[in-house]
C-alpha cells in the first residue's frame, strides 16, 4: 500500500502570453498520494468548473482559455489539496496580446483659418501601439504647431490654408500595424477684403467704377450698399480666380453717397462678413454754389427728429448736389453703423453726430453752422464712447481695415471752439446734461447753445480761439 | 501710451520764482488741453489754471491771477508752470493734469516746491 | 467763482458699509462734475465723469447720482482698498473747483 504523500507542484505555472481569440493553457503538474483536488483562480476569484470559456481537464491539471479577450488579462493560480499536509500553490501571469486596433477614427473636419483643429485616433493594443499620421502621402512631421496627443489624436494649433488635405493615422505594435481611413482636414478662411473700394470726388453725371477685391474660404459673395441701402442703380461685374472675388460696380452720379462693398462668406450655420466704404461726392459746379456754402432751413428728416431741437434751423451744406438728401443719407448709414456699439456710447454718439451732421444755423448774409462745443466732442469720444475708440484708432495704427464707427462722419474735437471760451459760438448736448438714472428714453432731445450763466472770461486771462477753419466732414 | 513727466522737486526761498514744466508724449500734444493743479502738505487739491497747448491761451484761477504764467513749446511738447513772489504756502505737490473733466484724464508724477528761508 | 461744498470733511467706517459723499455747488453746474479717488503719495483718479458715469476699469460699487446742485458720490459695499481721500470737481466753467475732500478712514 503507497504511503500518503502531500501534493508538490513539479511544473510551476509560467507567464503565458496569448493573443486575442486564441487558445491559452496553464499546466500545473502535481505529484501526490491520494490524488488532489486542483482548483483554479484568476486574481484570487475561483474559476466555477461549469464556466463555458474555459476547459479543465487532465484532472484539473490544465486550465485552458478557449478563446482569449482582453478582459482575461490577470494572474491565474492553481491550488493542489489532498489533505496530507497543506495545500499548495503556484501562480502565472496572462499576458493578453493584441494587435493594433483603431476605436475611434478620425472624422472628417472643416475648420476656420487660425483655431485649434483636433482630429481623433484612440487606439487598443498590446503592447500599447505607438501612433503616426500621414498627410496625403507622406508622414506628418510634428512641430511647434502639429503635436501627435499622449492619446494618438493629431492636434494643430493655429490652422493654416497648407494644413487642408487627406489624413490617416497609423497605429503599430509588435505584432502589426493599423490603418484609418482618409479623412479630410478643411481650412476655411474668414471673408478679407483685399482691395478697398477708393473714395471719388466727381462732377455732376459722371460714371465711375468702384472695385472691390475679397478673399475667403469658401469664396466670398460681395454685394454693395448705398447710403444703407441696396444698391438701387448701377451694373456690378464680377469674375473669382483662385479664392478671390472681384467685384466692379459701375455708377452714373446724380447725388453724393457712400458706397459699403460687404464680402461675405458662410461658415456651417455662421456667416463672416467684411466691410469697406467710399464716398462718392460732386465737386461744385457753379461759382454761385462756391461763393455760398450753405442755407439753413428747418430739419425735414427723420433719423435725428427726436435727437433735433424742435423747428430748429440746421446748416445744410451745398457742396451736395442735394443737401437735404445727402445730409439724411450719411446719418442713415451712421446710424446702422451704431447698432454694434455699446448702449453707453451710442445715445451720445447719436447726440453727437446729429448735431454735427445738422448743425445749428445762424441765417444771415452769409449762413454760419455753428459746431459743436469741444468738450461734448470729447465726452462722447472719450467717456461715453472710450472702447469703441480706441479699438477702432488701435485697427487704424495697425493698418488693419477699419470697420464701424471709421465710416462716421465724426468732428475732430480739437479743431472745435470751447464752450468756457465763447458760450455762444458752439452747440451743447443736452443729451450729457440730463441726470441719466431717472430717463430711460430721450424723446426729444434738443441740441441748444450754452446758456449765458457761463462767464466770459476776461480776455486777458482766457483767450482760447474759436477755429474760423471748421468745416464739415 | 499717454505720458506726462514733470521736472524735479525745486526749493525756493521767498520772493522767488519757480517754473515746473510737464513734458506730453503719446499723443498729440496740440489737441488737448493742459491743467495745474496743487496740494499743499496735508491739504485739498486746487485748480490753478488752464493752457491751449495750441496757441498758448490760458485762463488762470482768481488766487494767483498775476503770479502765474503758463506756456507751451510745441516743439518739445512741453507745457510749462511759472510761479513768481512764492510764500511759504505755495510749498505744495504741483501736477499738470490733461483734460481734467471733459476727455481721458492723465496726470503728471507731481512736483514737490518748497519755499523755506 | 462757484464754490463746492463736501461733506462729510472726514468720516470712519467699516469693511462691506455703504457710504455716501455728498458735494453742493454754490450754482447750477448742471451735470459737470468728476469724483476723484487719492491715496496718500499718489496721484488723483478719476472715479465717475459727468455726474454718474463710471470711468472704465473702475469696480461698479461706486456710483454717482444728482445735478444742478446737488450731487453724491455712493460705495455700496466699502473694500479695504477704498479707504483714501475723495474729492469732487466742477468743470462747467472756469475756474473749475473742486471740493475740500472727504477723508474715509478705518473704523
Known amino acids: 500500500e503507497k504511503l500518503p504523500k502531500a501534493p508538490v507542484i513539479t511544473t510551476p505555472l509560467e507567464t503565458v502570453d496569448a493573443l486575442v481569440e486564441e487558445v491559452a493553457t496553464f499546466m500545473c503538474a502535481v505529484e501526490s498520494y491520494p490524488q488532489p483536488e486542483i482548483s483554479w483562480t484568476r486574481n484570487k476569484i475561483l474559476i466555477k468548473l461549469f464556466d463555458t470559456r474555459y476547459s479543465i481537464r487532465e484532472n484539473g491539471q490544465l486550465l485552458t482559455i478557449l478563446s482569449v479577450e482582453d478582459s482575461d488579462d490577470g494572474i491565474y493560480c492553481c491550488i493542489a489539496n489532498n489533505g496530507v499536509g497543506g495545500a499548495v500553490e503556484s501562480c502565472g501571469a496572462l499576458q493578453v496580446k493584441m494587435k493594433p486596433k483603431i476605436t475611434r477614427p478620425p472624422i472628417n473636419v472643416k475648420i476656420i483659418e487660425g483655431l485649434k483643429a483636433v482630429l481623433p485616433c484612440t487606439t487598443m493594443g498590446n503592447p500599447k501601439p505607438s501612433v503616426s499620421w500621414i498627410k496625403g502621402d507622406n508622414a506628418l512631421r510634428e512641430n511647434s504647431r502639429i503635436a501627435v496627443l499622449e492619446s494618438g489624436s493629431l492636434r494643430i494649433h493655429n490652422v493654416q490654408k497648407e494644413d487642408a488635405g487627406q489624413y490617416r493615422c497609423v497605429a503599430k505594435n509588435s505584432l502589426g500595424t493599423a490603418y484609418s481611413k482618409l479623412v479630410k482636414l478643411e481650412v476655411e478662411v474668414f471673408a478679407r477684403i483685399l482691395r478697398a473700394p477708393e473714395s471719388h470726388n466727381v462732377t455732376f453725371g459722371s460714371f465711375v467704377t468702384l472695385r472691390c477685391t475679397a478673399i475667403g474660404i469658401p469664396v466670398p459673395t460681395i454685394s454693395w450698399i448705398e447710403n444703407g441701402n441696396a444698391v438701387s442703380s448701377g451694373s456690378i461685374q464680377e469674375s473669382v480666380k483662385d479664392r478671390v472675388i472681384d467685384s466692379r460696380l459701375q455708377l452714373f452720379i446724380t447725388k453724393p453717397g457712400l458706397y459699403t462693398c460687404i464680402a461675405t462668406n458662410k461658415h456651417g450655420e455662421k456667416f463672416s462678413t467684411a466691410k469697406a466704404a467710399a464716398t462718392v461726392s460732386i465737386a461744385e459746379w457753379s461759382k454761385s454754389q462756391k461763393d455760398s456754402q450753405g442755407y439753413c432751413a428747418q430739419y425735414r428728416g427723420e433719423v435725428c427728429d427726436a435727437v433735433l431741437a424742435k423747428d430748429a434751423l440746421v446748416f445744410f451744406n451745398t457742396s451736395y448736389r442735394d443737401p437735404e438728401d445727402a445730409q439724411e443719407l450719411l446719418i442713415h448709414t451712421a446710424w446702422n453703423e451704431l447698432k454694434a456699439v455699446s448702449p453707453l456710447c451710442r445715445p451720445a454718439a447719436e447726440a453727437l453726430l446729429c448735431n454735427h451732421l445738422f448743425q445749428e444755423c445762424s441765417p444771415g448774409v452769409v449762413p454760419t453752422p455753428m459746431p459743436i462745443c469741444r468738450e461734448y466732442c470729447l465726452a462722447v469720444k472719450e467717456l461715453f464712447c472710450a472702447k469703441e475708440w480706441q479699438a477702432m484708432e488701435g485697427k487704424a495704427h495697425r493698418g488693419l481695415y477699419r470697420s464701424g464707427m471709421h465710416l462716421l462722419p465724426v468732428p475732430e474735437c480739437s479743431k472745435l471752439p470751447s464752450m468756457h471760451r465763447d458760450p455762444t459760438a458752439c452747440t451743447r448736448l443736452p443729451y450729457l446734461d440730463y441726470k441719466k438714472e431717472n430717463i430711460t428714453t430721450f424723446p426729444s432731445i434738443t441740441s441748444s447753445r450754452p446758456s449765458a450763466d457761463i462767464p466770459n472770461l476776461p480776455a486777458s486771462t482766457s483767450s482760447f480761439a474759436v477755429s474760423p477753419a471748421y468745416s464739415m466732414t | 501710451q499717454v505720458q506726462l513727466v514733470q521736472s524735479g522737486a525745486e526749493v525756493k526761498k521767498p520772493g522767488a520764482s519757480v517754473k515746473v514744466s510737464c513734458k506730453a508724449s503719446?499723443?498729440?500734444?496740440?489737441?488737448?488741453?493742459m491743467h495745474w493743479v496743487r496740494q499743499a502738505p496735508g491739504q485739498g487739491l486746487e485748480w490753478m489754471g488752464i493752457?491751449?497747448?495750441?496757441?498758448?491761451?490760458?485762463s488762470y484761477a482768481q488766487k494767483f491771477q498775476g503770479r502765474v504764467s503758463m506756456t507751451s513749446d510745441t516743439s518739445t511738447s512741453t507745457v510749462s508752470m511759472e510761479l513768481s513772489s512764492l510764500r511759504s504756502e505755495d510749498t505744495a505737490i504741483y501736477y499738470c493734469?490733461?483734460?481734467?473733466?471733459?476727455?481721458?484724464?492723465?496726470w503728471g508724477q507731481g512736483t514737490l516746491v518748497t519755499v523755506s528761508s | 467763482d462757484i464754490q463746492m461744498t463736501q461733506s462729510p470733511s472726514a468720516m470712519s467706517a467699516s469693511v462691506g458699509d455703504r457710504v455716501t459723499i455728498t458735494c453742493r455747488a454754490s450754482?447750477?453746474?448742471?451735470?459737470?462734475l468728476a469724483w476723484f479717488q487719492q491715496k496718500p503719495g499718489k496721484v488723483p483718479k478719476r472715479l465717475i465723469y459727468?455726474?454718474?458715469n463710471l470711468q472704465s476699469g473702475v469696480p461698479s460699487r461706486f456710483s454717482g447720482s444728482g445735478s444742478g446742485t446737488e450731487f453724491t458720490l455712493t460705495i455700496s459695499s466699502l473694500q479695504p482698498e477704498d479707504f483714501a481721500t475723495y474729492y469732487c470737481?466742477?468743470?462747467?466753467?472756469?475756474?473749475?473747483?473742486f471740493g475740500q475732500g472727504t477723508k474715509l478712514e478705518i473704523k
Open positions: 493734469a490733461r483734460e481734467l473733466g471733459w476727455g481721458s484724464d492723465y
Open positions: 503719446g499723443y498729440t500734444f496740440t489737441s488737448y488741453y
Open positions: 493752457i491751449n497747448p495750441s496757441g498758448g491761451s490760458t
Open positions: 450754482q447750477d453746474i448742471r451735470n459737470y
Open positions: 459727468i455726474a454718474s
Open positions: 470737481l466742477q468743470h462747467n466753467s472756469y475756474p473749475y473747483t
